[in-house]
């Protein structure tokens, strides 16, 4: 079948990195600069993606593969294929329309991107706070107070009624 196909279509012999040039008797011509063909038998080469402005080149375009972009330092990718860049913030902050803002009390963000999230409510799992939360870190929940009392059974007690200051979830 391959032989039959190549007799019918000389373009099928053109490898990746070339295109079948109709203007030159269908011979295989190399892709021009800033273009590529990732598969054989192509009648045109595709233009390479350009990494400009806030983007930087992660992988150069070659005759057989497209360029890949990421964001310059201080920024991170958003969207499919890093289609947009967004400013980083510090841990303990989130990006708002007014820029990077510290997380409100009771919330944290342990990354340079994304939003501040509420601390875990340990009491909902019948546990107590072992390590307090900060703007950068979630609380660490420990065993429930009942588990720590001498002679406590190993059966986990039911979750207590909600603690003051916590609304039911």
């Amino acid at each position: 079948f391959e032989r039959t196909r190549s007799l019918q279509d000389p373009c099928s012999n053109c490898p990746a990195g070339t295109f079948c040039d109709n203007n030159r008797n269908q011979i295989c011509s190399p892709c021009p600069p800033n273009s590529f063909s990732s598969a054989g038998g192509q009648r045109t080469c595709d233009i390479c993606r350009q990494c400009k402005g806030v983007f930087r080149t992660r992988k150069e375009c070659s005759s057989t593969s497209n360029a890949e972009c990421d964001c310059t330092p201080g920024f991170h990718c958003l969207g499919a294929g890093c289609s947009m860049c967004e400013q980083d913030c510090k841990q303990g902050q989130e990006l708002t329309k007014k820029g990077c803002k510290d997380c409100c009390f009771g919330t944290f963000n342990d990354q340079k991107r994304g939003i501040c999230r509420p601390w875990t409510n340990c009491s909902l799992d019948g546990k107590s706070v072992l390590v307090n939360g900060t703007k950068e870190r979630d609380v660490v929940c420990g065993p429930s107070p009942a588990d720590l009392s001498p002679g406590a059974s190993s059966v986990t007690p039911p979750a207590p009624a909600r603690e003051p200051g916590h609304s039911p979830q």
């Epitope: 402005g53 806030v54 983007f55 958003l78 499919a80 289609s83 947009m84 400013q87 007014k98």
Partner: antibody
Framework: EVQLVQSGAEVKKPGSSVKVSCKAS????????ISWVRQAPGQGLEWMGD????????NYAQKFQGRVTMTRDTSTSTVYMDLSSLRSEDTAVYYC?????????WGQGTMVTVSS | AIRMTQSPSSLSASVGDRVTITCRAS??????LNWYQQKPGKAPKLLIY???SLQSGVPSRFSGSGSGTDFTLTISSLQPEDFATYYC?????????FGQGTKVDIK
């Protein structure tokens, strides 16, 4: 919140030049490019070129090469677009826009009228 | 330059209608396609980036899809404030280019 504030409307004679400014208020340009996009009356959007303010490097669409110059003043967080040899077809609203892979913040636009 | 072609050029629709606008690139642009809304006398507003990601603050009735050369903007239930002109734009290779626009007006 970062806003892009442009200079006011201009009326120019054919053959003259116009310089439109775009100032970042409430923030800085950061590492983003600032593009200039124009829109003739009743027409679509046309990209003219861009500049990365922190580097001062400009890149122009071929159609405007030789007629357009984009510059910046980092001390005032302002970019400028200078278009020379004006003709009637250059009558348009000129927008600056922050480019981070998409134009997410736009200036209010500057109407440039070219008329003898 | 990569040519962007939108269809239709204009359409008439009623509040509550589902509206679909298409955009075709003259060569593959992967998912580097943005959609904007423009109202008379105003600057364009970014709706969708990366073909399908909703820009912050944009209502969820707007959605985008597609990859390669064919893309779609869908408004699931048209609202009075959605009557405007919509543009696609490729951010794959300079010069960045826009479609000619699709005007959505009241039936």
């Amino acid at each position: 919140e970062v806003q892009l504030v442009q200079s006011g409307a201009e009326v120019k004679k054919p053959g003259s030049s116009v310089k439109v400014s775009c100032k970042a208020s409430g923030g800085t340009f950061s590492s983003y490019a600032i593009s200039w996009v124009r829109q003739a009356p009743g027409q679509g959007l046309e990209w003219m070129g861009d500049i990365v303010p922190i580097f001062g490097v400009a890149n122009y669409a071929q159609k405007f090469q030789g007629r357009v110059t984009m510059t910046r003043d980092t001390s005032t967080s302002t970019v400028y677009m200078d278009l020379s040899s004006l003709r009637s077809e250059d009558t348009a609203v000129y927008y600056c826009a922050r480019d981070r892979g998409a134009f997410d913040i736009w200036g209010q636009g500057t109407m440039v009228t070219v008329s003898s | 330059a990569i040519r962007m072609t939108q269809s239709p050029s204009s359409l008439s629709a009623s509040v509550g209608d589902r509206v679909t606008i298409t955009c075709r690139a003259s060569q593959t642009i992967s998912s580097y396609l943005n959609w904007y809304q423009q109202k008379p006398g105003k600057a364009p507003k970014l709706l969708i980036y990366g073909a399908s990601s909703l820009q912050s603050g944009v209502p969820s009735r707007f959605s985008g899809s597609g990859s390669g050369t064919d893309f779609t903007l869908t408004i699931s239930s048209l609202q009075p404030e959605d009557f405007a002109t919509y543009y696609c734009q490729q951010s794959y290779s300079t010069p960045w280019t826009f479609g000619q626009g699709t005007k959505v007006d009241i039936k």
